[in-house]
């Protein structure tokens, strides 16, 4: 799997999980989240060469198409596969509220 | 939806469905498929600017992050959303066989 265990341990130019820390205030302009101040969002990036972690039949076909037609621009792309939620604390007035924001953290990637 | 109805009608630099015809023999080296000789596989390509058809909370966050940090390399990517199967005819010796190959045709795209 193209997850932290694999990607953060290996220097990989191909599609892999990349570390990305997002500071809510500085990077998103969000002042409403009290805790945490930021989080490890991560992101997916890198080349999708021939059949590198291809996700669907179509992406495998596209990968094969690209190998045989190297001048083609139709190549698979490195995107998130598994996502996890993030629990945040914010205030409505003076009242604290805990909320779970879905699909905020990328855990693994794929070529799609 | 970033489908044929929208994308094939508009000239769009942003993430959209692009037409791609694949000839099985010429483009994939597949001699075993008898019919069809090829098919409209399509593919997804184009930029994913701020909130352009963002798929998940993470891709929306990443989109916003990129707007505030334009030098960042962490941007969403244009990938397939809805896929459809393709029915093929091939031969086992002289005996014809019909098979449905799943996820062979891209019908729409998203920024993920």
């Amino acid at each position: 799997a193209l997850d932290a265990a694999y990607c953060f341990r290996n220097v990989q130019d191909n599609c892999c999980l990349r570390p990305l820390y997002i500071d809510f205030k500085r990077d998103l302009g969000w002042k409403w989240i009290h805790e945490p101040k930021g989080y490890n969002a991560n992101f997916c990036a890198g080349a999708c060469p021939y059949l590198w972690s291809s996700d669907t039949q179509h992406s495998r076909v596209l990968s094969l198409y690209n190998t045989i037609n190297p001048e083609a621009s139709a190549s698979p792309c490195c995107v998130s596969q598994d996502l996890e939620p993030l629990t945040i604390l914010y205030y409505i007035g003076k009242t604290p509220k805990i909320e779970q924001l879905s699909n905020m953290i990328v855990k693994s990637c794929k070529c799609s | 939806a970033l489908d044929a109805a929208y994308c094939f009608r508009n000239v769009q630099d942003n993430c959209c469905l692009r037409p791609l015809y694949i000839d099985f023999k010429r483009d994939l080296g597949w001699k075993w498929i008898h019919e069809p000789k090829g098919y409209n596989a399509n593919f997804c390509a184009g930029a994913c600017p701020y909130l352009w058809s963002s798929d998940t909370q993470h891709s929306r966050v990443l989109s916003l992050y990129n707007t505030i940090n334009p030098e960042a390399s962490a941007s969403p990517c244009c990938v397939s959303q809805d896929l459809e199967p393709l029915t093929i005819l091939y031969y086992i010796g002289k005996t014809p066989k019909i098979e449905q190959l799943s996820n062979m045709i891209v019908k729409s795209c998203k920024c993920s």
Epitope: I68 | W32, G93
Partner: antibody
Framework: QVLLVQSGADVRKPGASVKIFCKAS????????MHWVRQTPAQGFEWMGS????????TYARRFQGRLVLTADTSTNTAYMELRSLKSADTAVYYC?????????????WGQGSLVTVSS | EIQMTQSPSSLSASPGDRVTITCRAS???????LAWYQQKPGKVPKLLIY???SRAPGVPSRFSGSGSGTDFTLTISSLEPEDAATYYC?????????FGQGTKLEIK
């Protein structure tokens, strides 16, 4: 040049399973159908089945149906043959072979063979 | 399943001889679903002829194939010492693919 490199010789007990790999190089693995054939002095050549990479369509000889699994890993250009519930009659040299293109076809390149001995 | 019967099962011939091996199918294969292979002791089979009469790349022109329906032949027009081997026919008109029992060719 086209090369099909198979795993080495193996000894198995009756009732066990064996899995042989066939690593392809020198051509576009996903464009060709891969076959498995075995050879014994008594039976000669016996075709076992074929697998089409990417789409994972496997065709099996009826006599092996139910205990043979053919797969192809396109990420490593490797085909696999797993034969279960082994009997002494399964002692043979097992070959992977690439076809000229059709599901059933002539086989233009063969692996070096993997000897499997089934003995208690 | 289609049975493939080769004849003769063995033969001995001299360099320069013309040699013919026949293969009979238990049912019609049509005109192009037959292949011929050469196998030397301890070696892997080598494709000689496919589609009943098409020579595989790199195969010397002294090897030729003919036939259709149920009767097929492999001909070596002028035997060379390196042609000593066992020759097999194979049908791929129907599943399962089946092979002949082999013809062992010895050079005198």
């Amino acid at each position: 040049q086209v090369l099909l490199v198979q795993s080495g010789a193996d000894v198995r007990k009756p009732g066990a399973s064996v899995k042989i790999f066939c690593k392809a190089s020198g051509y576009t693995f996903s464009s060709n159908v891969m076959h498995w054939v075995r050879q014994t002095p008594a039976q000669g050549f016996e075709w076992m089945g074929s697998v089409i990479p990417i789409v994972d369509i496997a065709t099996y000889a009826r006599r092996f149906q139910g205990r043979l699994v053919l797969t192809a890993d396109t990420s490593t250009n490797t085909a696999y043959m797993e034969l279960r519930s082994l009997k002494s009659a399964d002692t043979a040299v097992y070959y992977c072979a690439r076809t000229l293109g059709l599901v059933l076809d002539a086989m233009d390149y063969w692996g070096q063979g993997s000897l499997v001995t089934v003995s208690s | 399943e289609i049975q493939m019967t080769q004849s003769p099962s063995s033969l001995s011939a001299s360099p320069g001889d013309r040699v013919t091996i026949t293969c009979r199918a238990s049912q019609s294969l049509g005109s192009s679903y037959l292949a011929w292979y050469q196998q030397k002791p301890g070696k892997v089979p080598k494709l000689l002829i496919y589609g009943a009469s098409s020579r595989a790349p790199g195969v010397p022109s002294r090897f030729s194939g003919s036939g259709s329906g149920t009767d097929f032949t492999l001909t070596i027009s002028s035997l060379e010492p390196e042609d000593a081997a066992t020759y097999y026919c194979q049908q791929y008109a129907d599943s399962p693919i089946t092979f002949g029992q082999g013809t062992k060719l010895e050079i005198k």
